[in-house]
């Protein structure tokens, strides 16, 4: 579909003559009639299968056209055609003397012809005009023309249709060969489909509208290319949706239980080594001169006491020293110059005579002890605490502190690591000697047993519309993600639509 | 081929809410969108919206807007229309089409709702 | 709201040629589709974009458009063609569509 335009622009008549050399009277009121046809290699009379149209009266004898709609005409004069432009065409212009109003054909005598001209050719579809000169002996007519198409309508011969639009169903612009044009941001057949913003992931993100980035569910991010780890996983991550897979050093369904309490907690102190022995516990290795469960606690060198024979114990920056009593001599006091002779034993202590009396020994009542049985007793002296604890003197009594796993009075009784009941899913916990053992019932398996291998609360396949199931180990239950569109534990309900119940 | 198949009919009380299936098979069902039209007993054939199955972007005829939802599952490859408050009038078959470039060149067979205390 | 209005009902002879109108504001710009409808059936897509037939429609079936006036043209009416044929635009802004109120065409 398009239009063959005219453009009359001259005509010159003037002496004011018609074809026939008869002069018009008073001038030649001229008007135009046009027929534009099928090529043919000569122009010959018959229909004008490709339209025809007709001027009002222009002017008088020799006159220029306006470039308008002047008198009710129209210039350029348009004949619309409905089929595909051939290329080529055949052009009739007659100019007519008018002597009345009455323009039509039978109403005019056939010698009212002033002039008439025949061209055909070959005319491309295009915006140029072609400009053209016809001269008869007694005329002259230049005028342009050109085949443009129709609003909607492109291509070499104004053949292909096109609407351009920007709604749901296409957002797009016609090419000049009618193809269609996405208008920026759109893609697809039909344009319909938004280009998302660049980078967003081609599974896991989508987009409603141009450069934008929506996450399916599971997914995060600018681009949805991260996934969401299990809700409530501390220090894990997830390759895919839902997971929870543990940092080094923690373990546990969360990720949550600390495995390596020496490296992120520092707990023992003065440069002690620190031992991880299982979830958050942990060892510490003192430095000469450190005690305590982390190592806190400095040793003075007299704490142990090291002076016999009631010698006196200084404390030194390396060590200590020992101020000996009368009579004894040596690095702890432990070599005598007396004998039973001097009456060395104190507190009812009986002396013996040794290597025929170059020594003695004391023998001490109850209560008293050392060389010369200076020294109450103490009651820690003889380390009676077992396992590493700590003796502490209590007046007449004494007390254990226990390192942690033991107990009892001198700290002799292996706490039971099974106490706790660390073994999960109903596993047999057995004690051993530096630590437990846990006997995993079946379908499970793990040093606690937390690791399901067979039972599996998604192989009932509890998760409709395409859902994907994880299974909760912490609860044995199952987890439903929903594909978009639905919602419900079992991803059952489409959006929108409420779950009915039957109460 | 192309098959769009939807769910069975339906009666229902006014002021009750219905959910029509239209389940796709034989094409590239994000490439395409879905449109739904009803026809009352003797009467036209009535738009009443669409959505995009690639990205859930929705229209829907005005004179519906409050009423009606539509929704789709990449996964399952289907469409689902639901409508509310239902009265008297909806009574109608509702039918889902495939919609490309605003052409619906395959239709399913076609969903009987019917409304009536 | 947008309206597209057809005549309620066309008769042809069997071979005459039938022509079925649609007119509507926006069909200057907008494209009209037209939908066979027959008895109990399921509607039928018979021209879309104006002037495209879809493959497997008849060569009679064909369409034009002309400023707010769109029209199927079934040339060589034959009775399987008896059906309710309706057209199908979007106003200007492409928000709103709508059918046409639908148009019987009897061959007798």
């Known amino acids: 579909s398009g239009v063959f335009q005219l453009q009359l622009q001259e005509f010159i008549n003037e002496r004011g003559v018609l074809a026939s050399g008869r002069p018009c009277e008073p001038g030649c009121r001229t008007f135009f009639r046009v027929c534009l046809k099928h090529f043919q290699a000569v122009v010959s009379p018959g229909p004008c299968t490709f339209g025809t149209v007709s001027t009002p009266v222009l002017g008088t004898n020799s006159f220029a056209v306006r470039d308008d709609s002047s008198g009710g005409g129209r210039n350029p004069l348009q004949l619309p055609f409905n089929f595909t432009w051939p290329g080529t065409f055949s052009l009739i212009i007659e100019a007519w003397h008018a002597p009345g109003d009455d323009l039509r054909p039978e109403a005019l005598p056939p010698d009212a012809l002033i002039s008439k001209i025949a061209i055909q050719g070959s005319l491309a579809v295009g915006q140029n005009w072609l400009l053209d000169e016809q001269t008869s002996t007694l005329t002259r007519l230049r005028y342009s023309y050109r085949v443009i198409c129709s609003d909607n309508y492109y291509g070499d011969n104004c053949s292909r249709l096109c609407k351009k639009r920007n709604d749901h169903f296409g957002h797009y612009v016609c090419q000049p060969d009618g193809n269609l044009s996405c208008l920026p941001g759109w893609t697809g057949e039909y344009c319909q489909q938004p280009i998302c913003l660049s980078g967003c992931h081609e599974q896991n993100g989508y987009c409603s509208k141009p450069a934008e980035c929506l996450c399916r569910p599971g997914w995060q991010g600018r681009l949805c290319n991260e996934c969401i780890p299990h809700n409530g996983c501390r220090h894990g991550t997830c390759s895919t949706p839902w997971q929870c897979t543990c940092d080094e050093g923690w373990g546990g369904l969360f990720c949550d239980q600390d495995l390596n309490y020496c490296t992120h907690h520092s707990p023992c102190k003065n440069g002690a080594t620190c031992s991880n022995s299982g979830q958050r516990s942990y060892t510490c290795t003192c430095r000469p001169g450190y005690t305590g469960v982390d190592c806190e606690l400095e040793l003075s060198e007299c704490d142990s006491n090291p002076c016999r024979n009631g010698g006196s114990c200084k404390d030194q920056e390396d060590g200590y020293h020992c101020l000996c009593p009368p009579g004894y001599y040596g690095l702890h006091c432990e070599h005598s110059t007396l004998s039973c002779a001097d009456s060395p034993c104190f507190n009812g202590g009986s002396c013996r005579e040794r290597n025929q009396g170059a020594n003695y020994a004391c023998e001490c009542p109850p209560n008293f002890t050392g060389s010369n049985c200076e020294k109450k007793v103490d009651r820690c002296t003889s380390n009676p605490c077992a396992n590493g604890g700590q003796c502490l003197n209590r007046g007449p009594s004494r007390m254990c502190r226990c390192r942690p796993g033991f107990t009892g009075t001198y700290c002799e009784l292996h706490v039971s690591d099974c106490a706790r009941n660390p073994c999960a899913h109903g596993g047999t916990c057995h004690d051993l000697e530096n630590g437990l053992m846990c006997t995993c019932p079946a379908g499970f398996s793990g040093r606690r047993c937390e690791v399901r291998t067979s039972i599996d609360a998604c192989a009932s396949s509890p998760c409709f519309n395409r859902a994907t199931c994880y299974t909760d180990l912490s609860t044995d239950t199952f987890v439903c993600n929903c594909p978009y569109g639905f919602v419900g534990s079992r991803c059952e309900f489409p959006v929108g639509l409420p779950p009915s119940f039957p109460w | 081929q192309v098959l769009l198949i939807q769910s069975g009919a339906e009666v229902k009380k006014p002021g009750a809410s219905v959910q029509v299936s239209c389940k796709a098979s034989?094409?590239?069902?994000?490439?395409?969108?879905v449109i739904w039209v009803r026809q009352a007993p003797g009467q036209g054939l009535e738009y009443m919206g669409w959505?995009?199955?690639?990205?859930?972007?929705?229209n829907y005829a005005q004179k519906l807007q409050d009423r009606v939802t539509m929704t789709s599952d990449t996964s399952t490859t289907t469409a689902y229309m639901e409508l509310r408050s239902l009265r008297s009038d909806d009574t109608a078959v509702y039918y889902c089409?495939?919609?490309?470039?605003?052409?619906?060149?395959?239709w399913g067979q076609g969903t009987l709702v019917t409304v009536s205390s | 709201s947008y309206e597209l209005t057809q005549p309620p009902s066309v008769s042809v002879s069997p071979g005459q040629t039938a022509r079925i109108t649609c007119s509507g504001d926006?069909?200057?710009?907008?494209?009209a589709y037209w939908y066979q409808q027959k008895s109990g059936q399921a509607p039928v897509l018979v021209i879309y974009e104006d002037i495209k037939r879809p493959s497997g429609i008849p060569e009679r079936f064909s369409g034009s458009s002309s400023g707010t006036m769109a029209t199927l043209t079934i040339s060589g009416a034959q009775v399987e063609d008896e059906a309710d044929y309706y057209c199908?635009?979007?106003?200007?802004?492409?928000?709103?569509?709508?059918f046409g109120g639908g148009t019987k065409l009897t061959v007798l």
């Open positions: 199908f635009s979007t106003d200007n802004s492409g928000d709103h569509s709508v």
């Open positions: 034989g094409y590239t069902f994000t490439n395409y969108g």
């Open positions: 089409a495939r919609e490309l470039g605003s052409s619906f060149d395959y």
């Open positions: 959505i995009s199955a690639y990205n859930g972007n929705t």
């Open positions: 926006a069909l200057p710009k907008k494209y």
